[in-house]
């Protein structure tokens, strides 16, 4: 907290100038007017204060806006804003995409700060929903956003906002994620063609229910490992040999380097040994010829 | 770890010239807003000058068209050019490297300048 001192002679502040960048933290305390500085937050950001000397101008605000900044001061607060706490941004109501991107230029290049976070959730619930624009921004500044939200969350995305999704935005999304995001993916591309449809939804595959890998396996997509280890192992487990061959295509030789992991691995456990030989691939580990496959999850659904 | 190195202070007459020189080591000046102040006997420490990473220089006012801030990134290193020397100039000069988006900022070890 800056001592109150009067204002020396000569140097009450008409306007925000670079000249203020010599003015000690008290004189700025005692010289500058908070209303002025409101009006002129503009010119902040392009005068280099110190890192101290911004906490003055944050103090000033502070006791000038005490339930929070309006919106026409917080489009302008440039370096100023990462100065300010979660509770801070907490008591602001920010409706414009400008002003959103405009803070979020500031923090560009570094992880996502608890006050980014606190931010993007108050500019979403004001929205009531994540539209493309928002969607389309968020994941320029932060790929991975999409990521960071919970199923509940991703619940209010529209399809419409799935074609704003890059595959980098999808890379730490984990399955429950990809259940909510895949239906929604599903829908936005829906009116596309083969090939060009399997380019879109591919990174969305991690949510897909096994009738659409079979869908997918009659449509000559020639799916890469790296997407193949991304599906969820109970949809891949009912695929027959033929399926899986006809979705990987010339892929399928890479199976042999993933024969111990998911989900190929539990994949195989599945298959009969006599169907992974025509594979010529060297698998091993499926069910032995003589032997009868009781699917007990069947049994149970019945019983 | 980091450390900025100052030289080139001294004793000269009024009128005189002296050059001095911060070279940082452990950081990389080009993304840093660099400053020099001065320090007189029982006064408070003042900001001289100042240049940002754009190259954009600011004055105090008692140096304008007699002292000039410069850096060099290549070499890492910070100028303060000082021409017209008066004995209101004497003081201890301090190079400081500052960042906007970091409470944490860096100091020289200080020189003497003595225009007398």
């Known amino acids: 907290e800056v001592e109150k001192t009067a204002c020396p002679s000569g140097k009450k502040a008409r306007e925000i100038d670079e000249s203020l960048i010599f003015y000690k933290k008290w004189e700025l305390e005692a010289c500058v007017d908070a209303a002025l500085l409101a009006t002129q937050m503009d010119r902040v950001n392009a005068i280099p204060f110190t890192y101290e000397q911004l906490d003055v101008l944050k103090h000033k605000l502070d006791e000038l806006y005490p339930q929070g900044y309006p919106e026409s001061v917080i489009q302008h607060l440039g370096y100023l804003f990462l100065k300010m706490s979660p509770e801070d941004i907490r008591k602001w109501n920010v409706t414009s995409l400008e002003t959103l991107k405009a803070l979020l230029e500031v923090n560009k290049g570094h992880e996502m700060s608890p006050q980014v976070a606190t931010l993007i959730d108050r500019f979403v619930k004001g929205r009531g929903q994540l539209d493309k624009d928002t969607l389309d921004t968020l994941t320029a500044f932060y790929p991975g956003y999409l990521c960071s939200l919970s199923p509940e969350e991703l619940s209010s995305v529209p399809p419409s906002s799935i074609w704003a999704v890059r595959p980098q935005d999808l890379d730490t999304c984990d399955p429950r994620q990809l259940d909510v995001l895949y239906p929604k993916a599903r829908l936005a591309f829906q009116n596309m063609n083969g090939s060009e449809y399997f380019v879109k939804i591919q990174s969305f595959l991690g949510g897909a229910p096994t009738e659409d890998l079979k869908a997918l396996s009659q449509q000559n997509v020639s799916m890469d490992l790296a997407t193949f280890m991304k599906l969820r192992t109970d949809a891949v487990l009912p695929l027959t040999v033929a399926e899986v061959q006809k979705l990987l295509g010339p892929h399928v030789e890479g199976l042999k380097a993933e024969e111990r992991h998911r989900p190929v691995r539990d994949w195989i456990l599945r298959q009969r040994q006599d169907d992974l030989d025509t594979l010529g691939l060297g698998l091993q580990g499926g069910i032995p010829n003589g032997y009868l496959v009781l699917d007990l999850s069947m049994q149970e659904a019945l019983s | 770890q980091v450390q900025l190195v100052q030289s080139g202070g001294g004793l000269v007459h009024p009128g005189g010239s002296l050059r001095l020189s911060c070279a940082a080591s452990g950081i990389d000046l080009s993304l840093y807003r660099m400053r020099w102040y001065r320090q007189a006997p029982g006064k408070e420490r003042d900001l001289v000058a100042l240049i940002t990473d754009d190259g954009t220089s600011y004055y105090e006012d008692s140096v304008k068209g007699r002292f000039t801030i410069t850096r060099d990134n290549p070499s890492n290193k910070v100028f303060l050019q000082m021409n017209s020397l008066k004995p209101e100039d004497t003081a201890v000069y301090y190079c400081?490297?500052?960042?906007?988006?970091?409470?944490?900022?860096?100091w020289g070890q200080g020189t003497q300048v003595t225009v007398s």
């Open positions: 400081n490297a500052e960042t906007p988006l970091s409470p944490v900022n860096y």
